[in-house]
Amino acid sequence: EEAQGDKIIDGAPCARGSHPWQVALLSGNQLHCGGVLVNERWVLTAAHCKMNEYTVHLGSDTLGDRRAQRIKASKSFRHPGYSTQTHVNDLMLVKLNSQARLSSMVKKVRLPSRCEPPGTTCTVSGWGTTTSPDVTFPSDLMCVDVKLISPQDCTKVYKDLLENSMLCAGIPDSKKNACNGDSGGPLVCRGTLQGLVSWGTFPCGQPNDPGVYTQVCKFTKWINDTMKKHR
């Protein structure tokens, strides 16, 4: 039974090549977290995914695919406001040691210019476990569609655990959710990155317990400033 690496519950394999900005952060050969390619040199993920060194898998929906790019990364920059106690500001930029080669299978994610409203249908993706609490890690990238939930409705579930830069998503009475191994991975709505998988209740996929994401639209300035600062 695992926790900090994360998963997709009640989803299905993503359409091949539909998430070319999706990356996996590996510890050695093992999945640690998901992430997204922001540009040739930078990956965005969750702050709680921090390690000393990362191997970044890009360019294939299948972990272990020998055609995939694997790039080492040894520098990462957490949001300075990240709290290990409340998990607010749960995002981090990882700088690749060498540039990613862009292709039809490796593309930059679109950062948001606005925050999408509650009710918007979005897709969360990852290689995290598809069962919980016992784990079953897929080799192929999994996707599930969820809807953004208003802060008012989400607060009914999570009370004061919810901070204002956290975003909730789920489907009422459904198990559809992220889980162990999906952390740091993308929640994409109308073609733009709106969330990064942050946390949820456990075992994963409990109906009416939404997934909680870092609300990326609140952090675009920090993302751009940090990449510029550490060029």
């Epitope: 039974e1 900090q4 209740t201």
Partner: antibody, heavy 122, light 108 residues
Framework: QVQLVQSGAEVKKPGASVKVSCKAS????????IHWVRQAPGQGLEWMGS????????NYAQELQGRVTMTTDTSTSTAYMELRSLRSDDTAVYYC???????????????WGQGTMVTVSS | DIQMTQSPSSLSASVGDRVTITCRAS??????LNWYQQKPGKAPKLLIY???SLQSGVPSRFSGSGSGTDFTLTISSLQPEDFATYYC??????????FGGGTKVEIK
């Protein structure tokens, strides 16, 4: 087999330090957090702190701040808890425990070590 | 910090009895409360998580209920192996994780 195996009993003098180890097996050590909980003879459970095996992030109980250090060695899947400036009231069984959860949050202890008795006596 | 108060601190019961233990939080912890069983010389063992979910492998005579500040652990028909000390804890507002003081269930 999923388990946490702790180091053996220790007898220490007041003012000394003790370092207890907790070796994980049967699961991905870096995907979990390890917590330390102690229990004085005939008393209840007291949370001491936690460490993320992957990031090294720590949170310590306020009353132990400055005396306790938690570390991990990912190459051996082992967590360590060092307690310094020992006093007689630190005499307790020390447990490591794995916290179950997903992502940044954890919700309960689903796996415990067998415990390590630390006796502080002059 | 959230304080957890368990009652009673001890109780005597007979095999077959229905036993109820309560845990009260000093402020609302939603349903993020867990129950553990500890036998002498052994580590605690998870029984119930999230106030009411039974941990895999735990007999169905154990059940949990409650939300907010008041929680109950019930053993529907006490068995000889159930004589132990029971603890609640909260993972809602952390750190710190806080435990109740324990309830010792003894043979009458």
């Amino acid at each position: 087999q999923v388990q946490l195996v702790q180091s053996g009993a220790e007898v220490k003098k007041p003012g000394a330090s003790v370092k207890v180890s907790c070796k994980a097996s049967g699961y991905t050590f870096t995907s979990e957090g390890i917590h330390w909980v102690r229990q004085a003879p005939g008393q209840g459970l007291e949370w001491m702190g936690s460490i993320s095996a992957s990031s090294g992030d720590t949170n310590y109980a306020q009353e132990l701040q400055g005396r306790v250090t938690m570390t991990t060695d990912t190459s051996t899947s082992t967590a360590y808890m060092e307690l310094r400036s020992l006093r007689s009231d630190d005499t307790a069984v020390y447990y490591c425990a794995r916290a179950a959860g997903y992502g940044a949050r954890h919700w309960y202890f689903d796996l415990w070590g067998q415990g390590t008795m630390v006796t502080v006596s002059s | 910090d959230i304080q957890m108060t368990q009652s009673p601190s001890s109780l005597s019961a007979s095999v077959g009895d229905r036993v109820t233990i309560t845990c009260r939080a000093s402020q609302s912890i939603s349903s993020y409360l867990n129950w553990y069983q500890q036998k002498p010389g052994k580590a605690p063992k998870l029984l119930i998580y999230g106030a009411s979910s039974l941990q895999s492998g735990v007999p169905s005579r154990f059940s949990g209920s409650g939300s907010g500040t008041d929680f109950t652990l019930t053993i529907s028909s006490l068995q000889p192996e159930d004589f132990a000390t029971y603890y609640c804890d909260q993972f809602y507002s952390t750190p710190p994780i806080t435990f109740g003081g324990g309830t010792k269930v003894e043979i009458k």
